[in-house]
């Protein structure tokens, strides 16, 4: 889904009732530590020498909702995610590097602690390089492992 296109339907008010306290995870993993802003995430990544995983999504996108569920329920992904600085965004940042091939959702982009966007770590869709679907969890897991192999090790 291209985020420049507005969804035709608004959520029913009943959908807005919180089932759990709202956290920065927005449902992507309540046991994980999430950063609040891109700037904070970059700082944490650089100072902790951990890669950053940025998830762009929208509450009103069926594919964001579907990917969120499998991501949150995938034990191996959740465990591996502990080694990342994590950020999920429901808005676009001004950094064009986070949308190398467009502002669609859901998309997942990795950033090295050297603050280099890992444009080389892509999904399986040629028209949306950083998109993942629920059936792509094995590929996402492999890509997370790839992102953990840093471009250069800080001494």
């Amino acid at each position: 889904k291209d985020t420049t296109v507005k969804s035709g339907a608004k959520k029913d008010p009943k959908d807005s009732r919180p089932k759990l306290p709202q956290t920065l995870s927005r449902g992507w993993g309540d046991q994980l530590i999430w950063t609040q802003t891109y700037e904070e995430a970059l700082y944490r990544s650089k100072t902790s020498n951990r890669p950053l995983m940025v998830i762009h999504h929208l509450d009103e996108c069926p594919h964001s909702q579907a990917l969120k569920k499998v991501f949150a329920e995938h034990k191996e992904i959740q465990k591996l995610a502990e080694q990342f600085v994590l950020l999920n965004l429901v808005y676009e940042t001004t950094d064009k590097h986070l949308s190398p091939d467009g502002q669609y959702v859901p998309r997942i982009v990795f950033v090295d602690p050297s603050l280099t966007v890992r444009a080389d770590i892509t999904g399986r869709y040629s028209n949306r390089l950083y998109a993942y679907e629920p059936s792509d969890t094995a590929l996402l897991y492999d890509n997370m492992k790839k992102a953990l192999k840093l471009l250069k090790t800080e001494l």
Epitope: K1, V5, A66, P134
Partner: antibody, heavy 120, light 107 residues
Framework: QVQLVQSGAEVKKPGASVKVSCKTS????????MNWVRQAPGQGLEWIGW????????NYNGKFKDRVTLTADKSTSTVYMELSSLRSEDTAVYFC?????????????WGQGTLVTVSS | EIVLTQSPATLSLSPGERATLSCKAS??????LSWFQQKPGQAPRTLIY???RLVDGIPARFSGSGSGQDFTLTISSLEPEDFAVYYC?????????FGGGTKVEIK
């Protein structure tokens, strides 16, 4: 094998509510989206909404506003669709339809349908 | 909401002939389109998802193609049991929407 078995036909008066059930088996209930779709006599198909049984998250077609409620009972692997303030134009066959086996949104398996007739 | 327009409304063909059904979306829906077959008094049956992926158990004579706004369902050689109504569905955006259907009838 995957099975979706819906409750029987209902006749309701205008203004009343109806609750249709869809009992599932043959797959991990909590990890596939469940959609509800309706079809008025001689008409096409209309999406009502979906629910994720794992946590109860829902999204509804805005057309139904506050009239529809989707719920799931994990203990019996059953989903429910309740429609209130019924009117004659709600007369239709109501279907439950499971999402993809891997949690994807596409509709894979369908229940047999439940006819709801609204008549005074 | 996204509008799906199916054409033709009715297709009159003989067994053994090739059927080509069209579904056009009012905006880009990537490849998030499914096709269903429905016979009178029955629930729909899913044939194709993600525009071109055949559901397990569906005969190979059914195939789907297209992306963006234009999609096609092709039945390479019609069998007697293929005469039915066919619907497309977009699941790119809420609310999911169906096309109006194409009836494939015996000529």
């Amino acid at each position: 094998q995957v099975q979706l078995v819906q409750s029987g036909a209902e006749v309701k008066k205008p203004g009343a509510s109806v609750k249709v059930s869809c009992k599932t088996s043959g797959y991990v209930f909590s990890r596939s989206w469940m959609n509800w779709v309706r079809q008025a006599p001689g008409q096409g198909l209309e999406w009502i909404g979906w629910i994720y049984p794992g946590d109860g998250d829902t999204n509804y077609n805005g057309k139904f506003k506050d009239r529809v409620t989707l719920t799931a009972d994990k203990s019996t692997s059953t989903v429910y669709m309740e429609l209130s303030s019924l009117r004659s134009e709600d007369t239709a066959v109501y279907f439950c339809a499971r999402g993809g086996y891997d949690g994807s949104p596409w509709l894979s398996y369908w229940g047999q349908g439940t006819l709801v007739t609204v008549s005074s | 909401e996204i509008v799906l327009t199916q054409s033709p409304a009715t297709l009159s063909l003989s067994p053994g002939e090739r059927a080509t059904l069209s579904c056009k979306a009012s905006q880009d829906i990537n490849s998030y389109l499914s096709w269903f077959q429905q016979k009178p008094g029955q629930a729909p049956r899913t044939l194709i998802y993600r525009a071109n992926r055949l559901v397990d158990g569906i005969p190979a004579r059914f195939s789907g193609s297209g992306s963006g706004q234009d999609f096609t369902l092709t039945i390479s050689s019609l069998e007697p049991e293929d005469f039915a109504v066919y619907y497309c569905l977009q699941y790119d955006e809420f609310p999911f929407t169906f096309g109006g259907g194409t009836k494939v009838e015996i000529k």
